[in-house]
């Protein structure tokens, strides 16, 4: 189970001194900023017990690993249920503190219930302030049942649950009727998964037989201590004032664990710490009781004496929970409760016994969880004790489970259990991804997603070139951080793979999909200059450049001419992918516009220095559109246009041009230059008869205006074919022939 | 469907007995506390009888107390009532209801009747 | 037992009116108060619980208010359907009382 614990400090004369804390002693727990580890949280939950809102609670981490609730400023804040998440991925878990009002009108007589898979259980609400009314039940915040007052037996309501389920599992409070919710008795139901003694998906394996109230869970076969013992079966008890999967946290405050309540992953829930019991857990236990709540007997046997935090403390000569074992019946020594191992490896596991006989190396064997015995293959005898080692053949996931070291002699018999946790090393599941590159180097990101079990200790980052066989190069870096890939050859793909490793021995994995690398191309080093330019139109500019010698061949593939607009603030660019060109003609250039023109080699992505810049001045755009655009047929073959000159020209107008096509025609139109300016009609010959045309024209400046509208006319029927359009003018406002 | 389904009612001469009974479905039966309601021909509603879940506790209307028994059997989601010693003034409709508790706006219970069965008519008449 | 006190005992009004039917109890019962309607021929049917608490599935036309003795179920705006009887139900004890009933009647 993950080592988590929520605290709830119950001295309750001011409430604005009562805190939460949750605890972790999960390795890198709640570092929350990095991949590995998800941050501790602590709240309020407000989804089944509501309470008037109040001021925002405080929440303060004390470093990495310890997360403090506080302000608490009226006693009802302190009302209702509380909340603490730790583990990362499928080790997440929830631990629940529920708070009950000392001064409701009901209390549980105790608030967490853990019951099996099929168990009856009661809750039972003492009347504290006694109201005539009804008493309802609810179960996470939905009516669940009703009792009358007068049905209250010995001053409790009682809820009976027969058969209860997992989905039973839950928040129930008694409330009566007329009273305010906060006056209400909470409880907590945890209903574990199986029935009594057993664990897995169908139930079929057995508990470890956890001692001191400890609590197995259904999923794992894991003892859940509780505070103030360790072992794989609780059967240690830590010093006073210690707490945590390893005892290694230490109550707060000069009276040790006095008024504190400890809340840990189900299927526990909630106790006082060991040696204190009572509803705010400021009692001691009374004598020859112990544990948490006080609610183990110590039954001392052999002269033994009963201490309230750890139970039996044995003279010498005798050992065991009540002292009732001799020392001259062997014991196993010193045994961890829980060893890891990485997957196919094959460890030593030493077991150590003592007793009178003492063990030998025949005497002491090891049983898998499959019921497989292994012998010691050598043994370590020294005056105090006998350690046996054995070697253990290459594991497998089924191995994981609880095993057993024994030891037999003529004195009797010893047995450890002990949990043993086989983790497959990480896989990653992605390739690095690539940040950067340049030309000698790639900066790579190592950090992905992995398959199989963290932490993760060490990440090796592994490339070559691609299509290489020579050795891969090896970079062992910080899984955090990203990595610079240093002296690469330039242009260059690079098969890179992360390989990730865990603790232990055989803890690394298998390599990572490789993914492919491309280092960038050199530089180009070379500057072009602008040998000249000129305009060919309105919006079309020639740019010639050149290059200086250097031996060797050149590096480039192309060049980029770059046009700045600075008066609309707009860049244009001009790819020419040829290193060996001098010359681009731009067209499609903005007319009348000032434009800063430059030149720069560039190698796949990267770009050569500029050439100094040009200052270019484009003429103006041509002139507007002539205006009142008409046609008349006058024969078979020969159409008039008259129009009228454009308006607002921004000088004299060089020519007219007249487009002819055939109405619905598919063949190119045909362009007629009309080169006196001055006229305003023109007669277009040499047409087909019958045949309907479109016009359209449109005047010359320096560069060619906008056109026309486009009129439609058909010449007069019964002619004979054309040669094609011919073209004759006249200025209609002197009506002279042409 | 949630339903209340009474049946039973029917004429009877005064100081005669009558059964009703009320069948329930759609519901968890056994966790609601039930009441039987009378309505004289014409008349309003009047409160008869009521019965907790456990049917450990019962309350009657003065106008009854001493000759109606209510009564459930949770196993068979059935309400009954034991009508002895009638009068005239029994003649009505009797209405089995189902009372639920719910939350106010300010978090606490309020209570009420908010399920019906059709009724059952009682005639007590010589 | 607590004494329900309902008025008026009928009312005529039309579609569209706003309509107002007091209930006063004989002693406190905060807002333990209940309204129902019943048609002709039909079980009772809850509208409103703990005094102005509105049931799932009942128009928003109907609305309740008062604390103490003094409550009042309102229809803002009247609607065929709402032609029936309405009574007025104390929770606040065991003995669970109800009004005489107020009928409203089309006019």
């Known amino acids: 189970a993950v080592d988590l614990t929520l605290l709830a400090n119950l001295r309750l004369t001011d409430p604005q001194r009562f805190f939460l804390t949750c605890v972790s002693g999960e390795a890198g727990a709640g570092r929350g900023s990095d991949a590995w580890g998800p941050p501790l949280l602590l709240e309020k939950d407000d989804r089944i017990v509501r309470t008037p809102p109040g001021p925002p609670l405080r929440l303060a981490r004390n470093g990495s690993h310890q997360v403090t609730l506080r302000g608490f400023s009226k006693p009802s804040d302190l009302v209702g249920v509380f909340s603490c998440v730790g583990g990362a991925g499928a080790r997440r878990t929830r631990v629940i503190y529920v708070h009950n009002s000392p001064g409701a009108h009901l209390l549980p007589d105790k608030v967490t219930h853990t019951v099996n898979k099929g168990d009856t259980a009661v809750l039972s609400a003492r009347v504290h302030k006694e109201k005539q009314t009804d008493v309802i039940w609810k179960s996470n915040g939905s009516y669940f049942y009703t009792l009358d007052w007068h049905e209250a037996q010995d001053g409790r309501f009682l809820l009976q649950l027969p058969n209860v389920q997992p989905p039973s599992s839950g928040i129930y409070s008694a409330t009566y009727l007329e009273a305010s919710p906060l006056g209400s008795a909470f409880f907590r139901l945890i209903v574990r998964g199986c029935g009594a003694g057993r664990w897995g998906p169908g139930c079929t394996k057995e508990c470890p037989g956890c001692l001191h109230g400890g609590v197995c869970h259904d999923h794992d076969g894991e003892c859940v201590c509780p505070p103030g013992f360790t072992g794989t079966r609780c059967e240690q008890a830590c010093r006073e004032g210690r707490f945590g999967q390893s005892c290694q946290e230490q109550c707060p405050g000069i009276s040790g664990c006095r008024g504190l309540t400890f809340c840990l992953p189900d299927p526990y829930g909630c106790s006082c710490g060991s040696g204190w019991r009572g509803s705010q857990c400021q009692e001691a236990c009374a004598p020859g009781h112990f544990g948490a709540d006080c609610r183990l007997q110590c039954q001392c046997q052999n002269g033994g004496t009963c201490d309230r935090f750890s139970g039996c403390v044995c003279p010498s000569g005798w050992h065991g929970v009540h002292c009732e074992k001799s020392d001259r019946i062997p014991q196993i020594l010193n045994m961890a409760s829980e060893l890891e191992f990485n997957l196919e490896t094959m460890p030593r596991i030493n077991c150590a016994a003592a007793g009178n006989p003492f063990p030998v190396r025949g005497s002491i064997e090891l049983r898998k969880p499959d019921g497989t015995v292994l012998l010691s293959t050598k043994a370590i005898v020294e005056p105090e004790k006998t350690t046996a080692e054995f070697e253990v053949p290459r594991l497998v996931l089924a191995d994981s489970g609880f095993w057993e070291c024994r030891v037999s002699t003529s004195g009797g018999q010893d047995s450890r259990r002990f949990k043993v946790n086989v983790k497959v090393p990480p896989v990653p599941l992605a390739a690095p991804r690539l940040l950067t590159k340049q030309s000698r180097q790639l900066v790579v990101s190592p950090l992905v997603s992995f398959s199989g079990d963290g932490p993760i200790s060490t990440v090796r980052l592994h490339y070559r070139p691609q299509d290489s066989t020579m050795d891969w190069s090896t970079i062992v870096v910080d899984p955090s951080e990203n990595v610079t890939l240093m002296n690469l050859r330039p242009k260059t793909g690079y098969s890179v793979r992360v390989q990730l490793s865990r603790p232990g021995e055989g803890g690394e994995g298998a390599w990572g999909p490789p993914t492919l690398m491309t280092t960038d191309c050199p530089e180009p080093l070379l500057q072009p200059w602008l040998e000249g330019w000129h305009v060919e139109g309105t919006d079309r500019l020639r740019v010639s450049w050149s290059l200086p010698l250097v031996p060797g061949p050149l590096v480039g593939d192309g060049f980029l001419l770059r046009l700045w607009d600075g008066t609309r603030g707009q860049e244009r660019r001009e790819n020419v992918s040829s290193p060996q060109a001098r010359t681009a003609l731009l067209t499609g250039l903005t007319p009348g516009t000032h434009y800063q023109l430059d030149v720069q080699l560039y190698h796949c992505t990267l770009l050569g220095p500029a050439s100094p810049p040009a200052h270019v001045l484009l003429p103006p755009s041509g002139p507007p559109a002539p205006r009142h655009l008409h046609a008349q047929a006058l024969s078979d073959s020969e159409i008039q246009l008259t129009w009228k000159h454009p308006e607002a020209l921004p000088g004299p107008i060089s020519k007219y041009v007249v487009e002819v096509q055939v109405a619905g025609g598919a063949g190119d139109p045909l362009w007629i230059d009309v080169d006196r300016p001055e006229e305003t009609s023109t007669i277009i010959r040499g047409l087909n008869a019958s045949t309907r045309y479109l016009f359209r024209m449109r005047a010359s400046i320096q560069g060619l205006g906008d056109w026309s509208n486009t009129v439609e006319e058909s010449t007069l029927g019964n002619g004979l074919q054309a040669e094609g359009p011919v073209q004759e003018s006249r200025a209609a406002e002197e009506g002279l022939d042409q | 469907e949630v339903q209340l389904l009474e049946s039973g009612g029917g004429l009877v001469q005064p100081g005669g007995s009558l059964r009703l009974s009320c069948a329930a479905s759609?519901?968890?039966?056994?966790?609601?506390?039930m009441q039987w309601v009378r309505q004289a021909p014409g008349k309003g509603l009047e409160w008869v009888s009521s019965?907790?879940?456990?049917?450990?506790?019962?309350y009657y209307a003065d106008s009854v107390k001493g000759r109606f028994t209510i009564s459930r059997d949770n196993s068979k989601n059935t309400l009954y009532l034991q009508m002895n010693s009638l009068r005239a003034e029994d003649t009505a409709v009797y209405y089995c209801a189902r009372q639920t508790y719910y939350y106010d706006s300010s978090g606490y219970f309020r209570n009420a009747f908010d399920i019906w069965g059709q009724g059952t008519m009682v005639t007590v008449s010589s | 037992d607590i004494q329900m006190t309902q008025s008026p005992s009928s009312l005529s009004a039309s579609i569209g009116d706003r309509v107002t039917v007091t209930c006063r109890t004989s002693?406190?019962?905060?807002?333990?108060l209940n309204w129902y309607q019943q048609k002709p021929g039909q079980a009772p049917n809850l509208l409103i619980y703990?005094?102005?608490s509105l049931e799932s599935g009942v128009p928003s036309r109907f609305s309740g208010s008062g604390s103490g003795t003094d409550f009042t179920l309102t229809i803002s705006s009247l609607q065929p359907e709402d032609f029936a009887t309405y009574y007025c139900?104390?929770?606040?004890?065991?003995?669970?009382?109800f009004g005489r009933g107020t009928t409203l009647e089309i006019q």
């Open positions: 019965i907790y879940p456990s049917g450990g506790a019962t």
């Open positions: 139900q104390q929770s606040y004890t065991t003995s669970y009382t």
């Open positions: 002693q406190s019962i905060d807002t333990y």
């Open positions: 703990g005094a102005s």
């Open positions: 759609g519901f968890t039966f056994s966790i609601y506390k």
